[in-house]
């Protein structure tokens, strides 16, 4: 029988009756177009909907849309569209909701074609007022609020100009002109590639790269001859063109851009590209693509100096640049993340890394099922997840892969189990473990979504006929109990609930299609009455991430520490609730040479856990850039992996000497930097 | 070979403490949660609560809860149990077991080894 | 807590008899159950983990089934040494055990 299907799967006792008295239905008085949604603040129940329908007249398209708001999580909606004054309102820039609990939200008016600039609609009560504010500029860009403070915001003009406000989007001023990309980094600080000749296409590569740490009033020139710039974690980089040809190499500053490294990376030619995959404060992921039309590239892992990098991961998967690569974090666990390889046969292997890029290895075959045709040996396969790159070649792939923070070890994705990624009609496999062992948990492909921190997953078949039935589960995906929510079976668009998986709530999106008409509905379901007590301490269990061989006494040791978690059981069927936190106890343990990456000039052959040096650096002095200076470094080849929190056992030495000399190539030397004020 | 040696019998009064020791040998001491269940004359197994020594961390029944403080002692591979406020139905012969363990679940798998058992009388 | 409920209570039975135990969860608790066996004066032995599983050593006329809240031990064939005393007991949090089978001789 499928999984979760079996007589003994323990049934939630009268939950027809429980969830019949708790699924609220809204029929949208609207023509069917597009619809989208935002959540407006964490925990406040907010979400707006704003669907647009456009008429396609002789000449030109005329445009409607409404605004739609509810305060109960989706049960109840109210029609606002009149407190925008019934504007047409552009869906390309959505709804820029403030971050954190701010409650702002800009919405970007469509205007028309002979005004001086465009128009906004501001909120700061969680859309219950709105006011209008004409532009001076015609945004290019949605509004982006600086993360620190709510009240600033920038944007981008057509005519790249690069345009701040102070309060909130009541007045706006322009800071700079020959603007091609802005962001904002931290303290309020704002960076910005501008160009001198043409425009951000002729003079790329020749980009400057600035810097406003007071919204315009001064400004720095923090690097010239710059392709393109990023941010991650407390890194920034910059791709510089090389002086004599046409590559370019990575640099990067953990000083807002006072100084600057290159980084030991290879460089990329016109057609290649470099990409940050993930960062945090400790460490980066970078992709650097192969030469050629390959569709693959290395991912290479950073020290905590963004500086030195180690090799993580052949073949990887990303055809162009903002291509599709299929590289996800597993956020339900610490050090785990899962993407694509390309193989030398071009099919397409799943990998999965335990130790934030130490290792790869293939995902386990899942013990309940069998190897399709992909697979050589019938007994020997393994799982392959279905991401990005599935659902771009138009697979038959509603989701990418799901995990949460808070709901611990959970990973939901779907997959084929053989030699390779199939292109058959995939199932949905679960994980409780972080992607350490699988389970198919429903046949076929399915929307899923998961609710309380773990205790209830969701899902709704994909199909393409009309669909009244969501199946739920209470038991981390082992048995599913459907429940249909309508008679009248709806077109399925989507799935919504409050991110960050704490809810109770999931709201079903669709229309429904009549003769003359269609209209956009929504079914709201609240799971409150199926887990009708809260969670208490006899409804978790203990549970050591990351767990191999109880009898290695560094059983769980990830980046030199392990956590156990308190995890729900999977036969309490109780709510953790809105307020719930995950629980996790840390135990240091003792350092090995897994806790460290290899410096500077040294590499790991492969299956060995020892640092050798470089063939090429045999016997020259190890002399390097850093900050602008000639760094001499005597090391015996290891340095700490970052994030890394062993203490005790191997302890390799390492010292660095600054040489005082300055290093002549790098193209961001502090010298070439300049300021300026307005 | 795996097992669990544990401190002799015990005679006590009734309001005493009684703490019970339980020597591992032959596997990773660290890696297994070590439970404690008791069995009264003529009568059933009884879970008290179990310990992960890495951690620290102890897990106890709801009816011993505030009687019963479970420990262990990394470097000498033990593990104590200790009951307090005795009264006479708490004569019982008092078992450790290791929690078998497959994979991060400490509890899911049964208790796979046993100590002898301890006898503990409760008596005036 | 999860209530275990073993049935019967004693059974009596002859060497070479199939003889099959039942044990009920009063809510599902999967597959985290195991069985024991005990003989006067001994501790326990495990048989029989996560429902269905032989613990290694353990003769295979033992076998386990059962998921959810309904579970079963079966002995296949019973032989002198299986007289004893056998308990469930559900793994899946705070443990429990049931109340026991005593298997005695017809």
């Known amino acids: 029988s499928a999984p979760g299907e079996d007589e003994e799967c323990g049934r939630v006792r009268d939950f027809v009756a429980k969830l019949a008295n708790n699924t609220h239905q809204h029929v949208f008085d609207d023509l069917r177009g597009s619809v989208s949604l935002s959540w407006v603040g964490d925990s406040t129940g907010v979400i707006l909907v704003l669907t647009t329908f456009h008429v396609p007249l002789v000449i030109m398209t005329f445009g409607q849309s409404k605004l739609y708001r509810s305060e109960d999580y989706g049960k109840n909606f109210k029609d606002i569209t009149d407190l925008i004054n019934n504007t047409f309102i552009r869906t390309e820039f959505g709804m820029a909701i403030g971050p954190e609990n701010s409650g702002k939200v800009v919405l970007t008016a469509e205007v028309s074609g002979g005004s001086r600039g465009g128009r906004i609609f501001r909120s700061s009560d969680f859309a219950k007022n709105f006011v209008q504010t004409d532009l001076p500029f015609h945004p290019l860009t949605q509004m982006m609020y600086s993360p620190q403070n709510s009240d600033y915001l920038l944007a981008l003009s057509t005519e790249n100009g690069l345009w701040v406000s102070k309060n909130f989007g009541g007045k706006w001023e322009e800071i700079h002109k020959a603007v091609c990309l802005a962001k904002w980094g931290s303290d309020n600080t704002i960076f910005f590639t501008t160009y001198a000749n043409g425009s951000c296409k002729a003079d790329l590569g020749a980009l400057e790269l600035w810097r406003t740490s007071d919204l315009g009033k001064s400004f720095k020139t923090i690097g010239v001859k710059i392709y393109s710039f990023g941010l991650g974690g407390r890194f920034l980089f910059a791709s510089v063109m090389a002086d004599k040809d046409t590559t370019r190499r990575i640099h990067v500053s953990t000083d807002q851009g006072d100084t600057w490294s290159m980084a030991q990376l290879p460089s990329v030619g016109q057609e290649q590209f470099y990409s940050i995959l993930a960062a945090n404060d400790d460490m980066v992921f970078m992709h650097v693509d192969e030469p050629g039309d390959t569709g693959f590239g290395t991912i290479f892992t950073s020290d905590d100096r963004g500086i030195v990098y180690s090799k993580s991961l052949d073949r990887h998967l990303y055809t162009t640049t903002g291509g599709e690569t299929d590289f996800t974090n597993v956020t339900s666990l610490r050090g785990v993340y899962i993407t694509s390889v390309l193989s030398e046969d071009n099919s397409i292997q799943t990998m999965i890394t335990f130790d934030q890029g130490g290792r790869w290895t293939h995902l386990r075959k899942p013990e309940n099922s069998e190897c399709d045709a992909t697979a050589k040996n019938k007994n020997e396969c393994s799982l392959h997840i279905h991401a990005s790159y599935s659902i771009s070649q138009k697979l038959n792939v509603p989701m990418a892969p799901l995990s949460e923070p808070n709901a611990v070890g959970i990973v939901i994705a779907h997959g084929s189990v053989g030699d390779a990624i199939s292109v058959m009609v995939p199932d949905v496999y679960i994980s409780d473990d972080g992607g350490y062992s699988w389970t198919k948990m429903l046949e076929g492909p399915h929307y899923y979504t998961i609710l309380d921190s773990g205790g209830i997953i969701v899902a709704i078949e994909h199909s393409s006929r009309p669909i009244n039935v969501i199946k739920f589960s209470t038991d981390e995906g082992q048995c599913w109990q459907t429940y249909t929510f309508t008679r009248d079976p709806i077109y399925f668009t989507g799935l919504a609930s409050e991110p960050g998986a704490r809810s109770m709530n999931i709201s079903i999106w669709g229309f429904t299609e009549s003769f003359l008409t269609s209209q956009w509905v929504s079914y709201t379901i609240d799971f409150k009455d199926i887990l009708e007590r809260n969670c208490e301490e006899k409804d978790y269990t203990i549970w050591l991430a990351h767990s191999t061989d109880p009898e290695d006494y560094e059983d769980g040791c990830i980046l030199g520490y392990k956590e156990q978690f308190l995890r729900l059981r999977k036969s309490s069927v109780c709510q953790n609730g809105r307020d719930y936190v995950v629980t996790k106890q840390p135990s240091i343990c003792l350092c090995s040479l897994e806790d460290f990456l290899c410096d500077f000039g040294y590499y790991r052959p492969e299956n060995d856990s020892k640092c050798v040096e470089q063939p090429e650096l045999k016997g020259h002095d190890l002399e390097f850039c850093l900050y602008g200076r000639e760094e001499h470094l005597t090391t015996n080849g290891y340095r700490k992996i970052p994030g890394d929190k062993c203490q005790g056992g191997v302890n390799p030495v390492r010292e660095v000497k600054d040489l005082k000399k300055k290093c002549t190539s790098n193209f961001l030397s502090p010298e070439k930097q300049n300021s300026k004020s307005n | 070979q795996v097992q669990l040696v544990q401190s002799g019998a015990e005679v006590k009064k009734p309001g005493a403490s009684v703490k019970v020791s339980c020597k591992a040998s032959?596997?990773?001491?660290?890696?297994?949660?070590m439970a404690w269940v008791r069995q009264a004359p003529g009568q059933g197994l009884e879970w008290m609560g179990g310990?992960?020594?890495?951690?620290?961390?102890?897990w106890y029944a709801q009816k011993f809860q505030g009687r019963v403080t479970i420990t262990a002692d990394e470097s000498t591979s033990t593990a104590y149990m200790e009951l307090s406020s005795l009264r006479s139905e708490d004569t019982a012969v008092y078992y450790c077991?290791?929690?078998?363990?497959?994979?991060?679940?400490?509890?899911?798998?049964?208790?796979?080894?046993w100590g002898q058992g301890t006898t503990v009388t409760v008596s005036s | 807590d999860i209530q275990m409920t073993q049935s019967p209570s004693t059974l009596s039975a002859s060497v070479g008899d199939r003889v099959t135990i039942t044990c009920r969860a009063s809510?599902?608790?999967?597959?985290?159950l195991a069985w024991y066996q005990q003989k006067p004066g001994k501790a326990p032995k495990l048989l029989i983990y996560?429902?269905?599983s032989l613990e290694s050593g353990v003769p295979s006329r033992f076998s386990g089934s059962g998921s959810g809240t309904e579970f079963t031990l079966t002995i296949s064939s019973l032989q002198p040494d299986d007289f004893a005393t056998y308990y469930c007991?559900?793994?899946?949090?705070?443990?429990?055990f049931g109340g026991g089978t005593k298997v005695e001789i017809k």
């Open positions: 077991a290791r929690q078998g363990r497959k994979t991060g679940y400490y509890y899911y798998y049964g208790m796979d080894v």
């Open positions: 032959g596997y990773t001491f660290t890696g297994y949660a």
């Open positions: 310990i992960i020594p890495t951690f620290g961390t102890a």
């Open positions: 809510q599902s608790i999967s597959s985290w």
């Open positions: 996560k429902a269905s």
């Open positions: 007991q559900q793994a899946d949090g705070h443990i429990t």
